[in-house]
């Protein structure tokens, strides 16, 4: 995240009534793999409803059905897990409702606690067919990001085969994972290719890598564990927003920043500027100007509209959001083209989002 030398103050001043934000934890819909799930968009008076998953537009396909205010997912898989949103567009405004979908069995990593189905994961090979390690059940490894409430049990699995039978070891954040690294240690069930951690706590957050190897090769797979506490969170910004944009000189452009926050957020739009001919202050940090912020005199702060743009408006625009817990920021670039060139949305160079927790 960038450091800033501010031309204008950017302090915590959340003044705008929170009509645009969901000020609570998103509702969680849980489904087991293979089940169907139906969710109703809990927004009133919606003329048009659009859906997103993890910030990406969601359209109908052979498993996803969108009918009016309902979203149906048929034959759910772990890939369907994520942060969903429905946006109701009305004539005067729009409103977004967020919810989580978690497609998983009772405990994490798509497996039931007793490992009753584990036998097929332990593949015996003909002793003549020497073979480097390989994954035997990639479906159970699809869900890489596991957001688990504190005190729950987590299981990560890496079902594999090979000849001779490979060995499995686990790393946490790229280093050997030792029993003493967590209170209560952990269990490894080699016959089920699994790592089990009971009663997870925030310090268990991180990347867990299984390394499966024999004399013919080595393969690995990484899971990310996020331990969700029942405490307020800093803002989350929808992935891919604001999006890069281009327009011709004299044209208009809009940047949108979609905010999810369980505490009242304060939104600021900031741009790199020059001061006395320099882009950087004496401390080496860039000069930044607050173009817009949420407050009593500002309309929808999630949108920054620029009219009749000039070449001087080109550059990076930062959406910075803070609540009393923390901050998040994402940025996008505006390209201003000479009059004769046609503008277009620059999907291919969308700024990479600043993912949080």
């Amino acid at each position: 995240r960038p450091s800033f030398s501010l031309v204008e103050d950017t302090t915590l001043e959340p003044e705008e009534p929170p009509t645009k934000y969901q000020i609570s934890q998103p509702e969680v819909y849980v489904a087991a793999p293979g089940e169907s799930l139906e969710v109703r968009c809990l927004l009133k008076d919606a003329a048009v409803i659009s859906w997103t998953k993890d910030g990406v537009h969601l359209g109908p396909n052979n498993r996803t059905v969108l009918i009016g205010e309902y979203l149906q997912i048929k034959g759910a898989t772990p890939r369907d897990s994520g942060l969903y949103a429905c946006t109701a567009s009305r004539t005067v405004d729009s409103e977004t409702w967020y919810f989580m979908v978690n497609v998983t069995d009772a405990i994490s990593s798509g497996d039931d606690e007793d490992d009753t189905d584990g036998a097929e994961d332990f593949v015996s090979e003909n002793s003549n067919n020497k073979r480097a390690p390989y994954w035997t059940n990639t479906e159970k490894m699809e869900k890489r990001l596991h957001a688990v409430p504190a005190a729950n049990t987590v299981k990560f699995r890496c079902p594999a085969g090979g000849n001779p039978m490979p060995t499995m070891r686990w790393l946490k954040n790229g280093k050997e994972f030792k029993q003493e690294h967590r209170i209560g240690g952990y269990k490894v069930r080699n016959q089920h290719w699994s790592l089990i951690m009971e009663s997870v706590v925030p310090s268990d957050k991180g990347n867990y890598t299984c390394v499966v190897e024999n004399e013919y090769g080595s393969i690995n797979h990484t899971y990310h564990l996020d331990v969700v506490e029942r405490s307020p969170h800093r803002p989350i910004l929808q992935a891919g927003l604001p999006a890069n944009a281009s327009t011709v000189v004299g044209g208009d452009v809009e940047f949108v920043c979609k905010v999810y926050s369980d505490a009242q957020p304060h939104i600021q739009w900031i741009k790199h500027v020059e001061k006395n001919g320099s882009k950087y202050g004496p401390d080496g940090l860039p000069y930044l100007k607050v173009l817009k912020h949420s407050g009593i005199n500002s309309s929808n702060a999630e949108v920054l509209a620029l009219f009749n743009v000039t070449e001087a408006d080109a550059g990076e625009y930062i959406c910075k959001v803070s609540n009393y817990i923390g901050q998040a920021n994402q940025s996008a670039w505006l390209t201003v083209l000479p009059k004769q060139q046609a503008p277009g949305r620059e999907k291919e160079i969308t700024a990479s989002p600043d993912y949080l927790e």
Partner: antibody, heavy 113, light 107 residues
Framework: QVQLQQPGAEVVKPGASVKMSCKAS????????IHWVKQTPGQGLEWIGA????????SYNQKFKVKATLTADKSSSTAYMQLSSLTSEDSAVYYC??????WGQGTLVTVSA | DILITQSPASLSASVGETVTITCGAS??????LNWYQRKQGKSPQLLIY???NLADGMSSRFSGSGSGRQYSLKISSLHPDDVATYYC?????????FGGGTKLEIK
Amino acid sequence: QVQLQQPGAEVVKPGASVKMSCKASGYTFTDYYIHWVKQTPGQGLEWIGAIYPDNGDTSYNQKFKVKATLTADKSSSTAYMQLSSLTSEDSAVYYCARAFTYWGQGTLVTVSA
Amino acid sequence: DILITQSPASLSASVGETVTITCGASENIYGALNWYQRKQGKSPQLLIYGATNLADGMSSRFSGSGSGRQYSLKISSLHPDDVATYYCQNVLSTPYTFGGGTKLEIK
């Protein structure tokens, strides 16, 4: 687990300054605001201000803007509050808190000649 | 600044009873209200955030309600361990003002 360690007490002379520390552990220091709160028997709890260690952003209660200066050292995961021109009115317990969710034990500041 | 008025200032109740503490804000704070419990000689502990959400590790005997300008904290089936001073706090806008506190005692 999340911990915020503060020195137990500071005794200072009127007119002097004091700089108290708040050492954070058990979480990513740069991800959360550190708030400072004053507790006195007469006034109850008062919010002094906050600092975001990632970029040094600060926000102050206007009442304490001249009195308090907030800083943070990312390398040691420590937040600091300096109080200047101390008077008997500044005698109080000062807490640091991570986003009001986790609180330090507090530093008792006694201003005495 | 948003003014937070908390009542009562002190409260005495018997074990097993249900008690309610209220907080009023000088303007609409849209549910941006936290409750804290401070036991004698200890630091404050987050009890309820966002007016209604129970914080980690706190007993479900505590519940928060309210919206707009009026909020309340309910403690059901009072335990001797609940003896403390309870504070509400505006977290909508800076300065994040606290209520004056309610000292809860057991009869």
